[in-house]
Interface confidence: medium
Amino acid sequence: KVFGRCELAAAMKRHGLDNYRGYSLGNWVCAAKFESNFNTQATNRNTDGSTDYGILQINSRWWCNDGRTPGSRNLCNIPCSALLSSDITASVNCAKKIVSDGNGMNAWVAWRNRCKGTDVQAWIRGCRL
């Protein structure tokens, strides 16, 4: 599923991401935009042999199990394919674990490069939340 901007903002808010660990909803929507272009089925392969999955491009080396990433930790204890569902529950729950890990949203390279320090509230402007 490819979410609309406001549709995703509403879903993320419903799942408790607004101000989760101090990150406003705009940060999460911005991260999703630049990680996956709001596409729940996005997959991207990395040079270390891992793959990023889903709307928040969660990595198989650390967070989920895709059965083929050497040394996978699977810290979210889920199959990576669950992160590709049109229901973002699994991605959100795993993202909450990631953002609580110590580096906050710096874990997402796209957030660090494209969202951090910008007017992230623009990503939820005009949305009925």
């Epitope: 089925q41 996005a42 997959t43 042999g49 895709d66 083929r68 990433t69 050497p70 590709l84």
Partner: antibody
Framework: QVQLQESGAEVMKPGASVKISCKAT????????IEWVKQRPGHGLEWIGE????????YYNEKFKGKATFTADTSSNTAYMQLSSLTSEDSAVYYC?????????WGQGTTLTVS | DIELTQSPATLSVTPGDSVSLSCRAS??????LHWYQQKSHESPRLLIK???QLMSGIPSRFSGSGSGTDFTLSINSVETEDFGMYFC?????????FGGGTKLEIK
């Protein structure tokens, strides 16, 4: 137990297309990548590409882009590979395998003859 | 693409001999190298994964070693059922690639 069952041998004319199937049983089909591998005598094994059935995400070896197309039907736990514009170079045995980085589970192979 | 070069192309041995098959990668692939055996008209069978991990059900006379660019499959005291083709495969990066194979034949 995990099994991959491929469709039977095919004999096709040059220029035609063929669709090979790979039915998976014994595991959660949507969770694992299915890989496709080509084997020609004297050419060893070549990785064609892969599909994640749960999402339809696909990756192709550059060499096979435009030649192979992967699809999957999660209702029947079956992956498909279509090969188009067939030539004699496409005559080979085609295998599906479960993509665990390494390939422990293989189909029995589908022999394609183009003549 | 990562190229895998296997040597020798053919190895003629007598049952009871011990042999070593080589697989060399064109760049470092850590331990992401797997070995397969294939007999005529059969699918490949995974023998060893990640350089040295023997798969369940594979006889202990098979062993794998190496890391980086140089890998070896060893068979201690070859048995008649071991004759066939041996391939290496890397899973360090895409596209996945295979070596050209080593044919193990009876002398």
């Amino acid at each position: 137990q995990v099994q991959l069952q491929e469709s039977g041998a095919e004999v096709m004319k040059p220029g035609a297309s063929v669709k090979i199937s790979c039915k998976a049983t014994g595991y959660t089909f949507t969770t694992y990548w299915i890989e496709w591998v080509k084997q020609r005598p004297g050419h060893g094994l070549e990785w064609i590409g892969e599909i994640l059935p749960g999402s339809g995400s696909t990756y192709y070896n550059e060499k096979f882009k435009g030649k192979a197309t992967f699809t999957a039907d999660t209702s029947s736990n079956t992956a498909y590979m279509q090969l188009s514009s067939l030539t004699s170079e496409d005559s080979a045995v085609y295998y599906c395998a479960r993509g665990d980085g390494n390939y422990y589970y293989w189909g029995q192979g589908t022999t394609l003859t183009v003549s | 693409d990562i190229e895998l070069t296997q040597s020798p192309a053919t190895l003629s041995v007598t049952p009871g001999d011990s042999v070593s098959l080589s697989c060399r990668a064109s760049q470092s692939i850590s331990n992401n190298l797997h070995w397969y055996q294939q007999k005529s008209h059969e699918s490949p069978r995974l023998l060893i994964k990640y350089g040295s991990q023997l798969m369940s059900g594979i006889p202990s006379r098979f062993s794998g070693s190496g890391s980086g660019t140089d890998f070896t499959l060893s068979i201690n005291s070859v048995e008649t059922e071991d004759f066939g083709m041996y391939f290496c495969q890397q899973s360090n990066s895409w596209p996945r690639t295979f070596g050209g194979g080593t044919k193990l034949e009876i002398k």
